[in-house]
């Protein structure tokens, strides 16, 4: 199942891919697309690089803001709209037969929050990220509250928020 | 106006080979992933092969990976399929085929040439 | 390997009726990544319809494609003379390509 993203209308999204180029700086092609990967490319191009920079991009919205030449090709959507949404393809055309890495991703677009006071912290991180993180490859999904986070202690929380909130964007798999 | 030109069919024993290829012209060959869709006599579609426009990347169907290489040469806006250990049941007409812009559907096709695989 | 299975095998149908034909899939296409394509004896195929419901380049509005997951449908409004001729459908979703066994469309 793909991870889902999620972001607030008029921010910026942010759906990670990388790769790791073997050896450094042997850059492969890689596209993205709007939908989930077809057999072999991308379906609906939104950007495609080459071996050497990105060659083809459907909207000045779409970005690769990572080090490219280290194999971050992240992809980076300003200024989401609701249309945004869905699911998104990016696929490594690593040469030879068959041997493309391809991963879904899912970008959910959401309608700004009212403002509303600040709750407690264990309140504000439940209902803030109620499905941040879960088991995905055992079935259906579980969700999982602050309260009964695997492994994951208060500083890693604060942290991650603080990312989230400075990035616009939520994660969680489905 | 996109022209696709397929030659090197004929008739070869079990084991045989041949090599079939598409002469393309009307587009910017580079550009677009090309394919290989073979139809044996009275039988419906099969899509065989498939090679992205840089030559990078390919793809076969298992009845043929093994047996079969795609190739382009796009200086010369060529696209081939060399075809190896051929079997009976590979006897067909063989288009060349250009993929849509948005890949992985065929918008243009040659008028095929038929591989007939007999002794 | 997803199987696409076209029905029915042959339509008999006039000029000007309307012609429906379906094509199932075995597992869900993803993303509706479907297509038709039209065959006429001793030609080559042309495509119609991709991503189930977008019409190909050049292709007449009497052509419609719908339908998602595991049920397609290529409707022909009004048949024209034409447009007799076998019909396949092919998947994209996932690998292998694969195509529908075909649907033919003959003069009754």
């Known amino acids: 199942s793909e991870v889902e993203y999620i972001a607030e209308v008029g921010q910026n999204a942010y759906l990670p891919c990388s790769y790791t180029p073997a050896p450094p700086g042997n850059l492969v092609p890689v596209c993205w697309g709007k939908g989930a990967c077809p057999v072999f490319d991308c379906s609906n191009v939104v950007l495609r690089t080459d071996n050497r920079d990105v060659n083809d991009r459907t909207s000045g919205r779409y970005w690769l803001k990572g080090d490219f030449h280290k194999g971050d090709v992240s992809l980076t959507i300003e200024n989401v709209t609701l249309a945004d949404s869905g699911v998104y393809c990016c696929r490594i055309q690593i040469p030879g037969i068959m041997n493309d890495e391809k991963h879904n991703v899912k970008l959910v677009v959401i309608k700004p929050a009212k403002v509303t006071p600040a709750p407690t912290l264990q309140r504000d991180l439940t209902s803030a990220f109620p499905r941040m993180l879960t088991t995905g490859e055992h079935g259906p999904a579980e969700t999982q509250t602050p309260g009964s986070l695997p492994d994951v202690n208060l500083t890693q929380i604060f942290t991650l928020t603080n990312e989230l909130r400075d990035s616009g964007a939520t994660i969680r798999t489905a | 106006e996109v022209q696709l030109l397929e030659s090197g069919g004929g008739l070869v024993q079990p084991g045989g080979s041949l090599r079939l290829s598409c002469a393309a012209s009307?587009?910017?060959?580079?550009?677009?992933?090309m394919s290989w869709v073979r139809q044996a006599p009275g039988k419906g579609l099969e899509w065989v092969s498939a090679?992205?426009?840089?030559?990078?990347?390919?793809y076969y169907a298992d009845s043929v990976k093994g047996r079969f290489t795609i190739s382009r040469d796009n200086s010369k806006n060529t696209l081939y399929l060399q075809m190896n250990s051929l079997r009976a049941e590979d006897t067909a007409v063989y288009y060349c085929?250009?993929?849509?812009?948005?890949?992985?559907?065929?918008?243009?096709w040659g008028q095929g040439t038929l591989v007939t695989v007999s002794s | 390997e997803i199987v696409l299975t076209q029905s029915p095998g042959t339509l008999s149908l006039s000029p000007g009726e309307r012609a429906t034909l379906s094509c199932r899939a075995s597992?869900?296409?993803?993303?509706?990544?479907l297509a038709w394509y039209q065959q006429k004896p001793g030609q080559a195929p042309r495509l119609l319809i991709y991503?189930?419901?977008s019409r190909a380049t050049g292709i007449p509005d009497r052509f419609s494609g719908s339908g998602s997951g595991t049920d397609f449908t290529l409707t022909i409004s009004r048949l024209e003379p034409e447009d007799f001729a076998v019909y396949y459908c092919?998947?994209?979703?996932?690998?292998?390509?694969?195509f529908g066994q075909g649907t033919k469309v003959e003069i009754k």
């Open positions: 085929a250009k993929d849509h812009w948005d890949p992985n559907f065929l918008d243009y």
């Open positions: 009307g587009f910017t060959f580079s550009n677009y992933w």
């Open positions: 090679i992205s426009g840089s030559g990078g990347s390919t």
């Open positions: 597992q869900s296409v993803s993303s509706s990544y």
């Open positions: 991503g189930a419901s």
């Open positions: 092919q998947q994209y979703g996932s690998s292998p390509l694969t």
